[in-house]
Interface confidence: low
């Protein structure tokens, strides 16, 4: 099967001024489709313009497998898919031309990653070791307490990784509550940085020391602070898909399907709000069809479909993956201790895989700089 590499954002090496756009976006469909289809294309373009980031649009257009997944989820007939693609190509050019500093920003965060990765790598390796040690000791936990890697549905990254922040949550706490990062900090389309919230958890037999807990939490929050300071107000320029192509393409595809069905039913589609929705919570058409939430695929599913090593910026996103992912510790009334131990081991392995990807991208960037 032909596939473009995952998360491949093909953006200009410089500002592309070679394509002045004289035609309105809707004109792509003119003369080649029936009027209803043309109107659907316009609706779809409006949706992309207002609700999909430039990065994600480019991903969709530069990655054949992502595009095919989108077309399948949207249930688009071939002629409409072709016309929509042309129109989106046109839209992408316009969006790119609006952001003249894109390339410079990319270089900025690549440089940042090159500088910071060696230290991050060392700390991540340390945390992986700790996770494995904790997994070995998990049998000491009270039978009634397990740790579930329950991910906020709005997160659009791997569903099975207890990352740095996750490692420092409530199982370590003495008092049963801990300030967490806001689950709204997903790496989906919104990627908004908004405050903090708290979470509580019943804790079982205390077998992690307060020192371990404190250490992991502080390290995590320190990293978050670094990244936040570095990115400042421009966070949304960098946090795009960050790995979950599957979720993005299906999510947008289902939104477009809803738009198309609504148009087919001759019902008006609600005007898309200016705020970008989460991919996992697509808008609904007035036809009443609620587009279902996209289920988070497993790590294995994603590793088959999401090829992260192809793109330098992904390295940076994966650092954010490690820093930002918010995992809640959850008290499960059922569940054996052995499952918890296995889960932690799996988490350590997945984190190690992420680190390997980061390391690989670091080498690529290093080689690129040396040339």
């Amino acid at each position: 099967e032909e596939a473009g590499a995952r998360v491949q954002q093909n953006v200009p090496s410089g500002t592309d001024t070679g394509d002045p756009q004289s035609k309105p976006l809707g004109d792509w469909a003119a003369g080649t489709m029936d009027p209803e289809s043309s109107i659907f294309i316009e609706d779809a373009i409006k949706y992309f313009k207002e609700k999909v980031s430039t990065q994600n649009l480019l991903l969709l257009l530069t990655d054949n497998e992502a595009w095919n997944g989108f077309v399948a989820a949207a249930e688009l007939p071939r002629n409409e898919a072709d016309e929509l693609r042309k129109a989106l190509d046109n839209l992408a050019r316009q969006m790119i031309m609006k952001d003249k500093n894109w390339h410079d920003k990319g270089q900025q965060y690549r440089n940042w990653f090159l500088k910071e990765f060696p230290r991050l790598k060392s700390e991540l390796e340390d945390n992986i070791r700790r996770l494995r040690a904790l997994a070995d000791g998990v049998q000491k936990v009270h039978k009634g307490t397990t740790i579930a890697n329950v991910v906020s549905g709005s997160l659009s990254i791997s569903s099975g990784i207890l990352t740095l922040v996750g490692m420092g949550l409530a199982p370590f706490t003495e008092g049963g509550s801990l300030v967490l990062l806001e689950p709204g900090m997903e790496l989906g389309i919104t990627a908004a940085l908004t405050g903090i919230t708290s979470s509580t958890m019943d804790y079982g037999k205390k077998w992690w020391t307060q020192a371990q807990a404190h250490d992991l939490v502080i390290k995590s929050l320190d990293k978050l602070k670094e990244v936040r300071e570095f990115l400042g107000e421009n966070i949304s320029n960098f946090l795009s898909l960050a790995g979950n192509t599957y979720q993005l393409t299906r999510g947008i595809g289902k939104d477009i399907r809803a738009l198309r069905r609504a148009r087919a039913n001759l019902q008006s589609v609600p005007h898309a709000s200016a705020s970008r929705p989460r991919v996992t919570e697509p808008i609904s058409a007035e036809s009443g069809e609620q587009v279902e939430r996209v289920n988070e695929p497993s790590i294995l599913e994603m590793s088959r479909g999401v090829k992260l090593t192809d793109v330098a910026p992904v390295s940076f996103f994966l650092v954010l993956d490690v820093v930002y992912l918010v995992y809640e510790s959850k008290h499960l009334h059922e569940g054996a201790k052995s499952e918890t131990a296995e889960e932690l081991k799996k988490v350590a392995q997945e984190l190690e895989e992420k680190l390997n990807i980061l390391n690989n991208n670091y080498k690529i960037l290093q080689a690129d700089q040396e040339l």
Epitope: N10, S13, T309, D310, D368, L371
Partner: antibody, heavy 119, light 111 residues
């Protein structure tokens, strides 16, 4: 370095696999491409295989060629050669950092292997 | 499908002179363009990528420019050794299918 092998005289319709053996290159870090050149003609891009193993082909090459790789080799399978496939086939490594983000450019090339398709 | 079209061959100029080769993409390739030099019986050599970035070891006499669909390779202070065929290549493999990422080639003759 890159070294292509497997080029030979074949009859039309007989599948042929060309192999590019790499040394000193980590294929998990580089995209690799196949380009061909018919005698006296220009370069013709066939396709690429990314560092992670994803493939992308020229529109005319889809179905006619398959690119795959191991840790030390990159293969190009010509599924059903025709006389038009007679050419020197080059294996090429994308420069470090080449991605969809920056574009794929080939800065290391093999010497090429000649495939002749004739009945 | 994206097609790359180059200046017709041959282009000739005297030693010390300047030659300009144009390359046009059928649609925008967002500055993702490379230039290669190939001499008879040899493998291609990357000169410029990203439309204007000089590959390591390539003399600064070679200059690439352009954006969108129009790109140019300029070789100044021509030397005899510059006699070769030059190819442009789209490094952009998205949005549309690629018929051939390479242009047809332009032969440069140095007098």
């Amino acid at each position: 370095s890159l070294e292509e092998s497997g080029g030979r005289l074949v009859t039309p319709g007989t599948p042929l696999t060309l192999t590019c053996t790499v040394s000193g290159i980590d294929l998990s870090s580089y995209a690799m491409g196949w380009v061909r050149q018919a005698p006296g003609k220009g370069l013709e891009w066939i396709g690429i295989i990314s560092s992670s193993g994803s493939t992308h082909y020229a529109s005319w090459a889809k179905g006619r060629f398959t690119i795959s790789k191991t840790s030390t080799t990159v293969d190009l399978k010509i599924t059903s050669p025709t006389t038009e496939d007679t050419a020197t086939y080059f294996c090429a490594r994308a420069r470090a950092g080449s991605t969809y983000y920056t574009g794929y450019y080939f800065n290391l090339w093999g010497q090429g292997t000649l495939v002749t398709v004739s009945s | 499908a994206i097609e790359m079209t180059q200046t017709a061959s041959p282009v000739s100029a005297a030693v010390g002179g300047t030659v300009t080769i144009n390359c046009q993409a059928s649609e925008s390739i967002y500055s993702n363009l490379a230039w290669y030099q190939q001499k008879p019986g040899q493998r291609p050599k990357l000169l410029i990528y990203g439309a204007s970035t000089l590959e390591s070891g390539v003399p600064s006499r070679f200059k690439g420019s352009g954006s969108g669909t129009e790109y140019t390779l300029t070789i100044s202070d021509l030397e005899c050794d510059d006699a070769a065929t030059y190819y442009c290549q789209s490094g952009y493999y998205g949005i549309s299918a690629i018929n051939n990422a390479f242009g047809g080639g332009t032969e440069v003759v140095v007098k």
